[in-house]
Amino acid sequence: MAVTACQGLGFVVSLIGIAGIIAATCMDQWSTQDLYNNPVTAVFNYQGLWRSCVRESSGFTECRGYFTLLGLPAMLQAVRALMIVGIVLGAIGLLVSIFALKCIRIGSMEDSAKANMTLTSGIMFIVSGLCAIAGVSVFANMLVTNFWMSTANMYTGMGGMVQTVQTRYTFGAALFVGWVAGGLTLIGGVMMCIACRGLAPEETNYKAVSYHASGHSVAYKPGGFKASTGFGSNTKNKKIYDGGARTEDEVQSYPSKHDYV
């Protein structure tokens, strides 16, 4: 039950995270005009990964796409790439994790297959979240660098052009959305990986060796218990302490994909 809950929660958290990454990537407010220490302006500028916008006090908003590819800064291209990779990995992860969900039955898919899929999707979510966090952080770093450069230009008078006020940009809402979304996707991925451990316990099966003792007979089977994470009860775990003496064949466990002997 706990495995299903962890897996389900991981899926939901990742879903919210990836939706947030998509939203952040599409948002126009990656950088917004810094109004601190500026005259009160009737025109407000903000920029996204794909276009820049101008909002006037009248309510009129005009956005222009970056119709050039080669003319854009390499850092912006890198941020775009990171966000897109994050979205693609996240989307594939979501698709895989849907089929991996314990509560969904698809044909005669075994738990081991679901475990592998859960792990795969978990890793994809982790990488997706890291891509988003990296992308947003690179952009934030770029903003900070440009902010202080333009501040220096403002005070040195832009080479004598004291009348020109340098437009400085600060963190936009999309950055915070991206950081949170990336974090959620990362957490969701970790939860999926934890759930995987519960779904696919490590098991090493050996041929059982019977030790016949006088009185009560105990069949001792090394590695008989599956290594459990504690998430839910494992129906495949079998009691190997039994009152009666057994033959080797009787003690042998049911075959599974994890029987490597």
Epitope: Q33, P39, V40, T41, A42, V43, N45, Y46, Q47, S52, C53, V54, E56, S57, S58, G59, F60, E62, R64, Q163, T164, V165, T167
Partner: antibody
Framework: QVQLVESGGGVVQPGRSLRLSCTVS????????VYWVRQAPGKGLEWVAV???????NYNSALKGRFTISKDNSKSTLYLQMNSLRAEDTAVYYC????????????WGQGTLVTVSS | DIVMTQSPDSLAVSLGERATINCKSS????????????LAWYQQKPGQPPKLLIY???TRESGVPDRFTGSGSGTDFTLTISSLQAEDVAVYYC?????????FGQGTKVEIK
């Protein structure tokens, strides 16, 4: 067609208050911003205040908070509440509509004269 | 506040001749986001309210004769009347539309020589 009609002007004593009205037709106050601009006799134009379509307002800081702009969308009326009036507030007060894009005043009323005198 | 300075204060031009009015702002009115200049030109005839001629420094308002041309960028702007007509006798104002308060120039009076 677009029309703006100012009213409420007149002679008022220094220190007193006056409320000007501007009734608009041909457009709605929820779609356009409207300004108050004044012109002292024989002088140039002075921007007073604006109320935007969304209800946000901006003022000329030189007026030191004595003037308040407001609007009643349902009545299509713009107001300018003027308190602690001084002789230098004597002017023709115009209301003008913002054109929407690139922030310019495309339609003006005929103005109402406010005279502050004892 | 942004200071708008017009020159000359008055201008006498013969009919059919070119009239040029300059306007200088204390700060750039060019917005980097859309590369637009937030400056407007108005014409005011005696006893009348002002009339919008040019907005965005160079865009002519609908119904305004094409002899009126606005140019310039940043801090320096010009209104040109290519061929002065009798009905163009008026006071012309430039206005900052970028920063609050939206200040006007002191005005330039255009007369016929």
């Amino acid at each position: 067609q677009v029309q703006l009609v100012e009213s409420g002007g007149g002679v008022v004593q220094p220190g007193r208050s006056l409320r000007l009205s501007c009734t608009v037709s041909g457009f709605t106050l929820t779609s356009y911003g409207v300004y108050w601009v004044r012109q002292a006799p024989g002088k140039g134009l002075e921007w007073v205040a604006v109320v935007w379509a969304g209800g946000n307002t901006n003022y000329n800081s030189a007026l030191k908070g004595r003037f308040t702009i407001s609007k009643d969308n349902s009545k299509s009326t713009l107001y300018l509440q003027m308190n602690s009036l001084r002789a230098e507030d004597t002017a023709v007060y115009y209301c003008a509509r913002d054109r929407g894009r690139l922030l310019a005043m495309d339609y003006w009323g005929q103005g109402t004269l406010v005279t502050v005198s004892s | 506040d942004i200071v708008m300075t017009q020159s000359p204060d008055s201008l006498a031009v013969s009919l059919g001749e070119r009239a040029t009015i300059n306007c200088k702002s204390s700060q750039s009115l060019l917005n980097s986001g859309n590369q637009k200049n937030y400056l407007a030109w108005y014409q005011q005839k005696p006893g009348q309210p002002p009339k919008l001629l040019i907005y965005g420094a160079s865009t002519r308002e609908s119904g305004v004769p094409d002899r009126f041309t606005g140019s310039g960028s940043g801090t320096d702007f010009t209104l040109t009347i290519s061929s002065l007509q009798a009905e163009d006798v008026a006071v012309y104002y430039c206005q900052n539309d970028h920063f609050f308060p939206f200040t006007f120039g002191q005005g330039t009076k255009v007369e016929i020589k």
